[in-house]
């Protein structure tokens, strides 16, 4: 008799999830010499242990601690780039500006980027049919808790000037409910972080509005200032030119505003 299986509102675990995580771990540790000591099988076991046989609406940060410990990594604390709703451009930027890091440039972020996973209470099975949706089902699901945990740790590690890339095309350029707005902003350490510099990326079409004057950016400035961290903001009017100028800073067209 087939067991009744919980139907969640979100997509199920990414197919070939165990193989993908293991393969990514191996690839990452090969490319990054400082992480060569990592045993990828142990990483997978710790990852699996965080959610397998557990109710997918009852996951805690504590569940991920063994994985966090194995994935401990030191990135230059003054070279951190946060992002909100503009992941692709942030990743394109760090691919060019190799000394800066997004969360997905770290081992743990790299392992989980764009993947979904969940298990089932009291069985060792991975649920490939459906997983809880953050809004419709529950917030303490395996994926959300993972990103909350790694994002908090990433923000806590930051120092000096921290940069954040924000999407100027969205109605809420700064969204308090995003991971950046709800987790990272509140875990920057005022004793270590001097300034948060926001880069507001204009969309597929430049306009002459100063999006740094947007009410949601003012709200971000207020939150940051109250935490005794300085705030600055820049418009990136042409993201294509911005990336081009990161690649070729000597280009004569890169002296003007981008």
């Amino acid at each position: 008799v087939p067991r009744w299986r919980q139907q969640w509102s979100g997509p199920g675990t990414t197919k070939r999830f165990p193989e993908t995580v293991l393969a990514r771990c191996v690839k990452y540790t090969e490319i990054h010499p400082e992480m060569r000591h990592v045993d990828c099988q142990s990483v997978w076991d710790a990852f699996k242990g965080a959610f397998i046989s557990k109710h997918p609406c009852n996951i805690t940060e504590e569940d991920y601690q063994p994985l966090m410990k194995l994935g401990t990594q030191t990135v230059p604390c003054n070279k951190i780039l946060l992002w909100s709703r503009i992941k692709d451009l942030a990743h394109q930027f760090t691919q060019v500006q190799r000394d800066m890091f997004t969360l997905e440039d770290t081992l743990l972020g790299y392992l989980a980027d764009d993947l979904t996973w969940c298990g089932e209470f009291n069985t060792s099975k991975i649920n490939y049919q459906s997983c809880p949706d953050w809004r419709k089902d529950c917030s303490n699901n395996p994926v959300s808790v993972f990103w909350k945990t790694v994002s908090r740790r990433f923000a806590e590690a930051a120092c000096d000037v921290v940069h954040v890339m924000l999407n100027g095309s969205r109605s809420k350029i700064f969204d308090k409910n995003s991971t950046f707005g709800s987790v990272e902003v509140h875990n920057l350490q005022p004793e270590k972080v001097q300034t948060l510099e926001a880069w507001v990326i204009h969309g597929g079409r430049e306009d002459s509005r100063d999006l740094c004057q947007d009410p949601t950016i003012k709200e971000l400035e207020s939150i940051i200032s109250k935490r005794n961290i300085q705030f600055s903001c820049k418009n990136i009017y042409r993201p294509d030119k911005f990336l081009q100028c990161v690649k070729n800073p000597e280009d004569s067209s890169c002296t003007s505003e981008i």
């Epitope: 597929g204 079409r205 430049e206 306009d207 100063d210 003007s256």
Partner: antibody, heavy 115, light 110 residues
Framework: SVEESGGRLVTPGTPLTLTCTVS????????ISWVRQAPGKGLQWIGS?????NTYYATWAKGRFTVSKTSTTVDLKINSPTTEDTATYFC?????????????WGPGTLVTVSS | AQVLTQTASSVSAAVGGTVTISCQSS????????LSWYQQKPGQPLKCLIY???TLASGVPSRFKGSGSGTQFTLTISDLESDDAATYYC??????????FGGGTEVVVK
């Protein structure tokens, strides 16, 4: 307001610069477009300059026109006029975001290219 | 290149009637609503009637109505008045800050 000036009769190949003088708003956070209209014809967008100083041109206009600005004026240089460039030239302010459109127009300045 | 087509070069209607002017874009305008409408009368500056596809510009009578999204747009003038006789243009804004104008439609009021 916006107002164009500099239109006149020129011979083919003689560069000509038209000026759009603005008042009542700042060019640092407004975009200005240049549009032309040949006698008896429709409107044709040439190019725009934004608060950032970045410029954009219609494909057909690249190399033929140059847009630049100071704090209160926007210039359109016709690099090497031909008889096909005979037209009335307008400058217009471009609205942004939820109010996109050319919301303020000048009366135009007439350029005649003839040998 | 993006092309804006106003199919009718001229439309006519009697005073009190309604005219509809269409504007079709070869590709979607930016955010599906970067489309505006203009009125041109001889010897007068161009006047913006509708911006962002459907928003009435300040001081423009509500007889003028803009509609549409993406690639298909319409300007409707109802309760036509003799003063509405003019040429009407649509303009579109596209990704990459490219703009363009339709060919224009003359409205004749009988």
């Amino acid at each position: 307001s916006v107002e164009e000036s500099g239109g006149r009769l020129v011979t083919p190949g003689t560069p000509l610069t038209l000026t759009c003088t603005v008042s009542g708003f700042s060019l640092s956070n407004n975009a200005i477009s240049w549009v032309r209209q040949a006698p008896g014809k429709g409107l044709q967008w040439i190019g725009s300059i934004y608060g950032s100083g970045n410029t954009y041109y219609a494909t057909w206009a690249k190399g033929r026109f140059t847009v630049s600005k100071t704090s209160t004026t926007v210039d359109l240089k016709i690099n090497s006029p031909t008889t096909e460039d005979t037209a009335t030239y307008f400058c217009a302010r471009e609205g942004a975001g939820s109010s996109w459109g050319f919301n303020l127009w000048g009366p135009g300045t007439l350029v005649t290219v003839s040998s | 290149a993006q092309v804006l087509t106003q199919t009718a070069s001229s439309v006519s209607a009697a005073v009190g009637g309604t005219v509809t002017i269409s504007c079709q874009s070869s590709e979607s305008v930016y955010k599906n609503n970067y489309l505006s409408w203009y009125q041109q009368k001889p010897g007068q500056p161009l006047k913006c009637l509708i911006y962002s596809a459907s928003t009435l510009a300040s001081g423009v009578p509500s007889r003028f109505k803009g509609s549409g999204s993406g690639t298909q747009f319409t300007l409707t003038i109802s309760d036509l008045e003799s003063d509405d006789a003019a040429t009407y243009y649509c303009a579109g804004g596209y990704s990459g800050n490219i703009n363009g104008f339709g060919g224009g439609t003359e409205v004749v009021v009988k």
